[in-house]
């Protein structure tokens, strides 16, 4: 058992040009605090995932109101330390996240509003019992100086936390076979009581006559390594030379996690997904109330009014996750038409729209013919965003204002002969054929296949069709 | 205003089925886009192009299916997966007018699948 302490130093705009802007201002002064969350191992998961070794919240920092015109100092920050406790073994590998909240005090309805500021995250080696570790980490142009650390809490000692100590019995030496416990010369490590033979290096116990394995580890003393190599079966066969697991009780057998969590065999050892209100490995860990504020992006904090009851985060629209800590992206569902950009602003959800299209959705077609006029005579028609040109006879091109040849696709039928003419063109037909394009055959009684005449024209009459 | 009705969720073995359904009513002019979620994440819904877009960890096991006429998405669930227990909300982009649109969330239905 330990506690992972985390001492922020600072946090405010970062070296180098594009200084953020103040998250205060005098109409909306705020403040900030910070949240912790650790996981085991140097997994590099999402920032939803859940904080395995623990999470913290740290106190609200002063009020700060920007001063204006001044460039944005260091922020004024929480007292003290964060503290996330653990119970077993420290693993000596970590992964961290680091979130900087903003509370806004104006005078919102209902309550303050919280946002997320910045998030750092980061994988470390960490040895228990070892001095503050300093760190930079810049998110944007903000930059943030902590320093954290790993003690154990006694009896327990070592690296991991595993080894235990008790005060002497005699005031001179240790008894047989126990070492002093550096640096507490004063105390003795505590007499060997975990199962006979269990590995000290990838063994640790609580109770006594019991062997748990550190991550990586199996076996009922903790001596095989966890492999990926094939195996014969889930387990692997029972050799400890392969480096499979051995035959026998899986992680999950007897279900290792706690207050109601469920267990999931992972390749190197087990999770716990754990109940609002629980944390930890094992889901040992709880005392997360509703006054530590855990519920973010301005969700409601119900029960949880003491350390054994747990407390439930009503989300608001938008938001999901155990502490309302993930936004949903409803650009997903694209909801923008037409090949419009999506953005997902948090308050609202907008659509940029590509040329030719507007409205919130990019649903509206625009009339691109406003003042393009097609030349010649041509008349402008809407569609697909883009406006084309129906030409007037004799032009053709994008805005009429080639001169189009009328003849180019031989409209005259029969062997007629095509001539350009300036309102269009005309055909002069073949022995045996009339019409504006020579498509009537001339019948030899002198009637044709015209259709019936206009008033005041016999069939067979010279006609020019234009 | 409009509101989303969510039914149809409950306990099932793994392996079985669940069918999910969210009505919308209101002042509504037209459906934009309407889909289930959980845990933040598209499970499957319609988009405003009207395709069909689904998660990659449901496909062939979820079908989604819209009743324009009573402004309906189905989310028909088959061989339901432990890992697939969540609350799943309903969410819609809904025009009330020609020119106003804005995005609406059901209260969300549990799904326990054991």
């Known amino acids: 058992a330990g506690v992972f302490e985390l001492q922020i130093h600072s946090f405010g705009p970062g070296p180098g040009p594009g200084a953020p802007r103040s998250p205060c201002s005098a109409r909306l002064p705020c403040r900030l605090f910070f949240r912790v969350c650790l996981k085991p191992g140097l997994s590099e998961e999402a920032a939803e995932s859940p904080c395995a070794l623990g999470a913290a919240l740290s106190a609200r920092g002063p009020v700060y109101t920007e001063q204006p015109g001044a460039p944005a100092p260091d922020l004024p920050l929480p007292d003290g330390l964060l503290q996330v406790p653990f119970r077993d073994a420290w693993p000596g590998t970590f992964s961290f996240i680091i979130e900087t909240w903003r509370e806004e005090l104006g005078d919102q309805i209902g309550g303050p509003a919280w946002s997320l500021l910045a998030r750092v995250a980061g994988r470390r080696r960490l040895a228990a019992g070892g001095p503050w570790a300093r760190d930079i980490q810049r998110a944007g142009a903000w930059e943030l100086r902590f320093s954290y650390r790993a003690r154990c809490e006694p009896p327990a000692v070592g690296t991991a936390c595993t080894r235990l100590c008790r005060p002497r019995s005699a005031p001179s030496r240790c008894g047989p076979g126990l070492r002093p416990c550096a640096p507490l010369e004063d105390e003795c490590e505590a007499p060997l009581v975990c199962r006979a033979g269990c590995s000290p290096e990838h063994g640790f116990c609580e109770q006594p006559g019991e062997c748990r394995c550190l991550e990586g580890w199996t076996g009922p003393l903790c001596t095989v390594p966890v492999s990926t190599s094939s195996c014969l079966s889930p387990r692997g066969p029972s050799s400890a030379t392969t480096g499979c697991l051995v035959p026998g009780p899986g992680p999950c057998d007897g279900n290792p996690c706690a207050n109601g969590g469920s267990c999931s065999e992972t390749p190197r050892s087990f999770e716990c997904t754990c109940p609002r209100g629980f944390y930890g490995l094992r889901c040992e860990v709880s005392g997360v109330t509703c006054a530590d504020g855990p519920c973010f992006n301005g969700g409601l904090c119900v029960g949880g009014a003491d350390p054994d009851s747990a407390y439930i985060c009503h989300c608001p629209p938008g938001f999901q996750g155990s502490n309302c800590e993930k936004r949903v992206d409803r650009c997903s569902l694209q909801p923008c038409r037409n090949g419009g950009l999506c953005l997902d602003l948090g308050h609202a959800l907008r659509c940029r729209c590509r040329a030719g299209f507007a409205g919130p959705r990019c649903e509206h077609d625009l009339d691109d013919c406003a003042g393009r006029a097609c030349a010649n005579g041509g008349t402008c028609v809407e569609g697909g965003g883009a406006h084309r040109c129906s030409c007037a006879l004799g032009f053709g091109g994008r805005d009429c204002r080639e001169r189009a040849d009328p003849c180019a696709a031989r409209p005259c039928a029969h062997g007629g002969r095509c001539y350009a003419h300036f309102s269009g063109l005309v055909c002069a037909c073949a022995p045996g054929y009339m019409g504006a394009r020579c498509e009537f055959p001339v019948h030899p009684d002198g009637a044709s296949a015209l259709p019936a005449a206009p008033p005041g024209l016999r069939p067979g009459d010279p006609q020019r069709y234009l | 205003q409009v509101q989303l009705q969510e039914s149809g969720g409950g306990l099932v073995q793994a392996g079985g089925s669940l069918t999910l359904s969210c009505a919308a009513s209101?002042?509504?002019?037209?459906?934009?886009?309407m889909g289930w979620y959980r845990q933040g994440d598209l499970v499957a819904g319609f988009t405003s192009e009207g395709?069909?877009k689904y998660a990659d960890s449901v496909k062939g096991r979820f079908t989604i299916s819209r009743d324009d006429a009573k402004n309906m998405v189905t989310l028909q669930m088959n061989s339901l997966k432990p890992e697939d227990t969540a609350v799943y909300y309903c969410?819609?982009?809904?025009?009330?007018?020609?020119?106003?649109?804005?995005?609406?969330w059901g209260q969300g239905t549990l799904v326990t699948v054991k």
């Open positions: 969410a819609a982009d809904i025009f009330s007018d020609r020119d106003h649109v804005d995005w609406y």
């Open positions: 395709s069909a």
């Open positions: 209101g002042s509504i002019f037209s459906i934009n886009a």
